[in-house]
């Protein structure tokens, strides 16, 4: 009977512990379900955010392309409506570009051609005055579009027209013959003849875009 | 004895159930911890995504404003006259004129003002590159719109804005005090400080006309 009582007491304890544990398990089960629900919500949020981010990236790419296109158009339109392209000087009916590199006469001519221009041609004393003033702060020589094969040939501009004798006197190597020909450069306001093979700065010239704007 | 055996059997069952339940609780506890960790990771992911989304939104806003500005400029430019007057160089948003006479800084400033312009202001390395290239064939100094009263004062542009220190180093008479002040000139791509009373060439600058007529 004493053993029986003791066993009954232990049984009561175990039943109590079992019930307590079952309660704990039930509570944990509910918490687990809630956690699972919360996790599902978080995953959904992540999916939504990732989708939004992807959409934003697409929109941004689109805006970026639009931007580039607009910049490109702006460059074109600006150049269209301007008498001269950027970095050129507009004077009267012409645009002038002072080269920033030194090349021989032929290479200088090519550089101008690639810019849809020709080497400098001086048609009048007004042209000469402008050029003399424009290079007044340089002591360097600048090739112009004037050359001749040898001293027995006339001085010709790139378009084949002859030099008007009253415009300026050509100094320097006027009586020299060079395999590459003799070319004219302007320096400190005076014009000189020299071997076309030498490297110098140059002046490109093209017609200004003066159609109705 | 029969009761005792029955009780013992029940006790064994209960102990077994209790152990089983304890095992279940331990397993659930581990699962819960893992779930908590996973939840923390998900929250971190959400934070990161939210931050990225915010950044993207900011970038997009910026691009959108740029776009609107470009569209606005495009509208204006589409119907505009020459961006710059004759003899000036058009580059980006500005017009530049290289003076053909030598004057002190104050006189140079007046000359620019009379042309509705100011002395050169360099805002960026791109501006500096352009100017360096534009004067590459000159060995002469050109006044720019930068000056200071004496070495204890900051270098200021004509509009009162300070010189950004990363743009260029000023050489020469930086430690000197002159009654007429100290002014900056650019020569062969470098910037020097000198007495504002000296005569030099100069560079005038004004906004290009990119507005509708």
């Amino acid at each position: 009977s004493q053993v029986s009582n003791l066993l009954k007491q232990q049984q009561t304890n175990l039943t109590h512990q079992k019930n307590k544990l079952e309660g704990q398990i039930s509570a944990r089960q509910q918490a687990e379900e809630a956690s699972q629900e919360s996790q599902n919500e978080l995953k959904e949020m992540i999916e939504t955010l990732a989708w939004k981010l992807n959409e934003k990236s697409k929109e941004q790419m689109e805006l970026h392309h639009q931007n580039l296109n607009l910049q490109e158009t702006l460059k074109r339109v600006a150049n269209c409506s301007a008498p001269c392209p950027q970095d050129w000087i507009w004077h009267e009916e012409n645009c002038y570009l002072f080269s920033t590199g030194s090349f021989n006469w032929e290479k200088s001519q090519e550089k101008c051609l690639s810019l849809d221009a020709k080497l400098l041609k001086i048609n009048s004393t007004a042209d000469l005055d402008f050029i003399q003033q424009a290079i007044s702060y340089s002591s360097f020589p600048f090739w112009m579009g004037l050359s001749r094969r040898n001293p027995s040939y006339p001085w010709l501009w790139e378009d084949g027209s002859p030099l008007m004798p009253h415009l300026f006197r050509i100094r320097g190597a006027v009586s020299q013959t060079y395999p590459s020909g003799t070319c004219a450069y302007i320096q400190r306001g005076a014009v000189y003849a020299e071997n076309c093979i030498l490297a110098a700065f140059s002046i490109c010239q093209k017609k200004a875009n003066l159609r109705a704007q | 004895s029969q009761v005792s055996n029955l009780l013992k059997q029940q006790q064994t069952n209960l102990t077994h159930q209790k152990n089983k339940l304890e095992g279940q609780i331990s397993a659930r506890q581990q699962a819960e911890e893992a779930s908590q960790e996973s939840q923390n990771e998900l929250k971190e992911m959400i934070e990161t995504l939210a931050w990225k989304l915010n950044e993207k939104s900011k970038e997009q806003m910026e691009l959108h404003h740029q776009n609107l500005n470009l569209q606005e400029t495009l509208k204006r430019v589409a119907n505009c006259s020459a961006p710059c007057p004759q003899d000036w160089i058009w580059h980006e948003e500005n017009c530049y004129l290289f003076s053909t006479g030598s004057f002190n800084w104050e006189k140079s400033q007046e000359k620019c003002l009379s042309l509705d312009a100011k002395l050169l202001k360099i805002n960026s390395t791109a501006d500096l590159d352009f100017i360096q290239q534009a004067i590459s064939y000159s060995s002469f100094p050109f006044w720019m719109g930068l000056s200071r009263r004496n070495p204890s004062y900051p270098w200021l542009w004509e509009d009162g804005s300070p010189l950004m220190p990363h743009l260029f180093r000023i050489r020469g008479a930086v430690s000197q005090t002159y009654p007429s002040g100290t002014c900056a000139y650019i020569q062969r791509g470098a910037v020097y400080a000198e007495n504002c009373i000296l005569a030099a060439f100069s560079i005038c600058q004004k906004k290009a006309n990119l507005r509708a007529q």
Epitope: - | S175, N195, L198
Partner: antibody, heavy 119, light 111 residues
Framework: QVQLLESGGGLVQPGGSLRLSCAAS????????LHWVRQAPGKGLEWVSV????????FYADSVKGRFTISRDNSKNTLYLQMNSLRAEDTAVYYC????????????WGQGTLVTVSS | QSVLTQPPSVSGAPGQRVTISCSGS????????VSWYQQLPGTAPKLLIH???HRPSGVPDRFSGSKSGTSASLAITGLQAEDEADYYC???????????FGGGTKLTVLG
């Protein structure tokens, strides 16, 4: 230790040429303007010419304009004075002097080199 | 004929105070600073005063400079035997774009 050392002086006939040099050390050469100043025997100081940091500004006394040329080589830390069409009145000790500003004071001087123009 | 005018000579006894004047015009002293140089016999000139009144380090405070209008002056107090030398004033003339010197003043320390 700032040092300026002139050389190239000597005896030359009227109408002749001479090139003076001034070797500099002990400072950042390109941060200073450089002058030539001369002193005829028993006379006072006479300024001859100045050149700015990179040679952008060059000024001359009226008495030497068109005959003398100032130049500098910043890579060699050297100042030069090319003297052509020399006259008897160019006879003097020629000093090179350093200036922290083109129009400011001469804070260091060389010891000078004597140029004698005589037939 | 120098652009800046100085007295050819001045003298004073040891311990005394002497001043050397330098007169110019509006295009030099009037619009620019003045420098003073000391030249001891047989040596190169040495900077004594710059920016009209500034003394370089190493120059005794017995030497002082001042400027007023188109004139400047150098004052030496507590005269010493080693101060016997030639003294030159110098400025920049913006009209002629050149450095201008005075003709020099010979300082004699008596006794």
């Amino acid at each position: 230790q700032v040092q300026l050392l002139e050389s190239g002086g000597g005896l030359v006939q009227p109408g002749g040429s001479l090139r003076l040099s001034c070797a500099a050390s002990g400072f950042t050469f390109s941060d200073y303007a450089l002058h030539w100043v001369r002193q005829a025997p028993g006379k006072g100081l006479e300024w001859v010419s100045v050149i700015s940091y990179a040679g952008g500004f060059k000024f001359y006394a009226d008495s030497v304009k068109g005959r003398f040329t100032i130049s500098r080589d910043n890579s060699k830390n050297t100042l030069y004075l090319q003297m052509n069409s020399l006259r008897a009145e160019d006879t003097a000790v020629y000093y090179c002097a350093r200036s922290p500003g083109l129009t400011s004071y001469h804070d260091s001087w060389g010891q000078g080199t004597l140029v004698t123009v005589s037939s | 004929q120098s652009v800046l005018t100085q007295p050819p000579s001045v003298s004073g006894a040891p311990g005394q105070r002497v001043t050397i004047s330098c007169s110019g015009s509006s295009s030099n002293i009037g619009s620019n600073y003045v420098s003073w140089y000391q030249q001891l016999p047989g040596t190169a000139p040495k900077l004594l005063i710059h920016s009209s009144s500034h003394r370089p380090s190493g120059v005794p405070d017995r030497f002082s400079g001042s400027k007023s209008g188109t004139s400047a002056s150098l004052a030496i107090t507590g005269l010493q035997a080693e101060d016997e030398a030639d003294y030159y004033c110098q400025s920049w003339d913006y009209e002629s774009e050149r450095v201008v010197f005075g003709g020099g003043t010979k300082l004699t320390v008596l006794g």
